[in-house]
Interface confidence: medium
């Protein structure tokens, strides 16, 4: 009874195709797989970022396989074929690793590169990125900003920068289409008359870095002898009225400060007939429905009532 | 208007130290970008140390272990201390303030000139 055996693939390699971190990783059947022409080869492949603990696991029958990679790090990988059970009479059977790794061969030292990278998505629409220079660099180093996001046939460079001492250290990006719920990449490098300067890669999501424009059109009305209901619009721009939390600051007679957090454009105040004087503000992030994360807008003009019986209207500024 | 006046330079042998100050006003030093550039005669001017606005502290090569960058938010200033001076540390040394985030303003002091004799 001879113990069956199988080759581990062949050609394993991890391919940069100048995304910025979206990588292949693709290689070959291995030899001698004649013996099991009836049956479905799989592969459990393993990679992940050199010093994170975990690997990602998975298993297909494809030769190729796709993800991002952090490219400040390398990046290691194994691959090896499994029999299923089907094809060698009850056990699975597995062939050894086949190993590889990649890395940019870094130039620079690490402090050359830029601190700080900083970027915003403004109402959804409009992103900003900013950075602050690297260490040891001369005043004539420049920065230059390239970004890719899956839908673009190739990595773009900034078009639009912002300048400071002569010096790239912002990005104005153009209109992104069809640019959120998928990793964006990132690479930031520079060139230096007098020395290499270290390149830095970033990776995030549109939707995570959202600032909205604070909300709109702040009312009151009066809906009992002791409630107010307070009212606002959700600011202009593409994002729905769903995907908004609210927080509100309310200051009465210029002592009491209530704060709440809300999910939609209305708050009820209790209050009393002896209230002189109502302000609030009300500031807008992108809520948990539509994002991971987001960014505080800034806060509403302040609208205030003082002086008149609220009973006897409506206001609106 | 924001001002930044850097002290403390001057003449002091191989071996010394100083620490140079950066009086800042019109800005919030707080989560500031801080740095400190240095110009020796004819060359180009070259970013020694910073401090980020979250308070992480990088140094040049040619400086690290011997130079130590600080803030004091209360004072609105930023310090350089710097030990072990070498003659080729003979420079104009230049506080450079950028705000937190995304703001694309950059603030420089006037200099001040450390001069390291052997």
């Known amino acids: 009874d001879t113990e069956i055996k199988v080759n581990p693939p062949q050609d394993f390699e991890i391919v940069d195709p100048g995304y910025l971190g979206y990588l292949y990783l693709q290689w070959q059947p291995p030899l001698s797989l004649d013996h099991f022409k009836e049956c479905t080869v799989e592969y459990e492949l393993k990679y992940r970022n050199i010093g994170s603990e975990t690997w990602k696991t998975i298993i297909t029958k494809n030769l190729h396989y796709k993800d991002g990679f952090d490219l400040n790090k390398g990046i290691e990988a194994k691959i090896h074929t499994l029999l299923p059970w089907q094809c060698t009479n009850g056990s699975e059977v597995q062939s050894s690793w086949a190993e590889t790794t990649y890395w940019i061969s870094p130039q620079g030292i690490p402090e050359t590169k830029v601190q700080d990278m900083d970027c915003v998505y403004y109402n959804w629409q409009y992103l900003l990125c900013s950075w602050k220079p690297g260490i040891g660099v001369l005043l004539d180093t420049n920065y230059n900003l390239f970004y890719w996001y899956e839908g673009l046939d190739h990595a773009l460079q900034c078009v639009d920068y912002i300048k400071a001492d002569g010096q790239n250290i912002g990005c104005r990006f153009p209109y992104l289409e069809a640019s959120d719920y998928k990793d964006f990449y990132i690479c930031v490098n520079g060139s230096s008359e007098n020395k290499p300067i270290r390149s830095s890669y970033f990776t995030f999501q549109l939707q995570n870095i959202v600032k909205p424009l604070p909300p709109v059109y702040l009312t009151f009305t009066r809906e009992s002898s002791c409630e107010i209901k307070l009212k606002w619009s959700i600011p202009l721009g593409p994002i729905p009225a769903r995907c908004f939390d609210y927080e509100i600051e309310i200051r009465e007679d210029d002592t009491t400060l209530v704060t709440a957090t809300v999910e939609n454009e209305t708050y009820t105040l209790k209050t009393t007939n002896e209230t002189r004087q109502l302000c609030f503000v009300v500031r807008s992030k992108v809520n948990i429905y539509c994002s991971d994360d987001g960014i505080w807008s800034e806060w509403s003009d302040k609208q205030c009532w003082e002086g008149e019986d609220l009973s006897k209207k409506t206001l609106l500024r | 208007q924001v001002q930044l006046v850097e002290s403390g330079g001057g003449l002091v042998q191989a071996g010394g130290s100083l620490r140079l100050s950066c009086a800042a006003s019109g800005i919030i030093f707080s989560g500031a970008w801080m740095g400190w550039y240095r110009q020796a005669a004819g060359e180009q001017r070259e970013l020694v140390a910073s401090i980020t606005s979250g308070d992480i502290t990088n140094y040049a090569d040619s400086v690290k272990g011997r130079f130590t960058i600080s803030r004091d938010n209360a004072e609105n200033t930023g310090y350089l201390q710097m030990n072990t001076l070498k003659p080729e540390d003979t420079a104009v040394y230049y506080c450079?303030?950028?705000?937190?985030?995304?703001?694309?303003?950059?603030?420089w002091g006037q200099g001040t000139l450390v001069t390291v004799s052997s």
């Open positions: 450079n303030a950028r705000p937190r985030g995304l703001s694309f303003s950059s603030y």
